[in-house]
Interface confidence: low
Amino acid sequence: KKVVLGKKGDTVELTCTASQKKSIQFHWKNSNQIKILGNQGSFLTKGPSKLNDRADSRRSLWDQGNFPLIIKNLKIEDSDTYICEVEDQKEEVQLLVFGLTANSDTHLLQGQSLTLTLESPPGSSPSVQCRSPRGKNIQGGKTLSVSQLELQDSGTWTCTVLQNQKKVEFKIDIVVLAFQKASSIVYKKEGEQVEFSFPLAFTVEKLTGSGELWWQAERASSSKSWITFDLKNKEVSVKRVTQDPKLQMGKKLPLHLTLPQALPQYAGSGNLTLALEAKTGKLHQEVNLVVMRATQLQKNLTCEVWGPTSPKLMLSLKLENKEAKVSKREKAVWVLNPEAGMWQCLLSDSGQVLLESNIKVLPTWSTPVQP
């Protein structure tokens, strides 16, 4: 008995060939001997089976002795043994229809679980293997689960169902809803305008939800909500914003926030959360702000940074075009009685300058001491 695998919703063509290469009488029946379709001369006739409106044949092939049974919009319950009777012979074809669906939505939040469920006919014992877009293979029976979805899991999952040494392939498009970056850091000199961008790693024509940016300033004892907003059809509308700092928000995606100026009291870490309509859970992106200030007070030239810097970052003070006068893995450095000229304060990581602030030191004219 020939075995053919089909996919739920697809079309399958079961073949039946006569030895004579001409149009002769044939008919297809199911295992209950109920006639599905056949011919009467050059006419297609249909029987009383439940397949009536979904069954067809290819008349153009009859003259060649081929009498296929075409079943459209396959259902799991179409799984059966189909019998083609032609020229006093019977050809049996076992059709097994499988379906593979994602547990809920195919749009899932980063960190959520994906469950794929296999629908299979009674009596079958298929095995399933799925390959994620990043090449990870998972195997299972009726259900396959992947916990903690990552951004790289977005894309087409290819699943192969194996039964009786035959296989059928399913493709399921999964979208992992996440920000492009889990975390970002912005380095600014005091007084500069700060731009925070929160690009999403997915696109949908409609996007509705609400969000909030909580900020933990380095100098503050507790975190504070800086802004809350709504997202409707990708249009952003601000619901509430603090007066200090007075953030501005772009009206379109990607989510974009502007801090009028970088100040030491704003340096710290923020967490932007986005709750999407009809989704449980939230998207998160961390953003960090490091602020630098260079000052000269009397005979002391000081450079300071505030915010979440890593211990390996180096802070230096140097006179332009000269070696660094002072370099430390600390958040403040200073030089007493600095020479006149343009001084540079540099925050660097393994030689790469992340932030630079220049300050001009003027010569001091000392009046001669009288004898």
Partner: antibody, heavy 118, light 111 residues
């Protein structure tokens, strides 16, 4: 201001490949989708596909699948569109276009004429 | 794919007169209260320019003599008082579904 500057005109033989570049400036390159749209001489506009510069993910019109490849270089803020197995009917002006929101095209490159002729 | 059909193919209108271009989609381009229909203007040797988005929103910098209307499958671009600089080909485009598809274009000339 936002600018998309494309590479110059190309003449190719049937069966060859062409690679057109589109250099973006004036905005955060990774934040917006870049699409490629072509226009055959005296004809209408046809969307070929799009690339997400942040992730490098690309989505193609079924009509061009298997023949088109879209890539990006974030270090130079440049997007590339390569079309292979060229035929005479691929003779067209190829535009890159930046989406504003959804699939509407707010900013366009100047266009690159690709002529396929034996 | 959603098929966009524009009419007429060409249109000759006197200066200062109203020009109306129609666009019909093979299926509704409405979703959640919005119509995902855009209109572009293209002059010879230039890339298209976005005029109207989401059926009736005027893109910034576009003169207000241009307006868009419609919903579902039937849409209209109107130029209330045709100017010499409006001579161009106009295209409609749906942005509801991938692939985005364009109409065949309507050539607007001065009578």
């Amino acid at each position: 201001q936002v600018q998309l500057v494309q590479s110059g005109a190309e003449v190719k033989k049937p069966g060859a490949s062409v690679k057109v570049s589109c250099k973006a400036s004036g905005y955060t390159f990774t934040a917006y989708v870049i699409s490629w749209v072509r226009q055959a001489p005296g004809q209408g506009l046809e969307w070929m596909g799009e690339i997400y510069p942040g992730s490098g993910s690309s989505y193609y019109n079924e009509k061009f699948k298997g023949r088109v490849t879209m890539t990006r270089d974030t270090s130079t803020s440049t997007v590339y569109m390569e079309l292979s197995s060229l035929r005479s009917e691929d003779t067209a002006v190829y535009y890159c276009a930046r989406s504003g929101d959804g699939s509407r095209f707010v900013y366009w490159g100047q266009g690159t004429l690709v002529t396929v002729s034996s | 794919d959603i098929v966009m059909t524009q009419s007429p193919d060409s249109l000759a209108v006197s200066l200062g007169e109203r020009a109306t271009i129609n666009c019909k989609a093979s299926q509704s381009v409405d979703y959640d209260g919005d119509s995902y229909m855009n209109w572009y203007q293209q002059k010879p040797g230039q890339p298209p320019k976005l005029l109207i988005y989401v059926a009736s929103n005027l893109e910034s910098g576009v003169p207000d003599r241009f307006s868009g209307s419609g919903s579902g499958t039937d849409f209209t671009l109107t130029i209330s008082s045709l100017q010499a600089e409006d001579v161009a080909v106009y295209y409609c485009q749906q942005s509801l579904q991938d692939p985005p598809t364009f109409g065949g274009g309507t050539k607007v000339e001065i009578k």
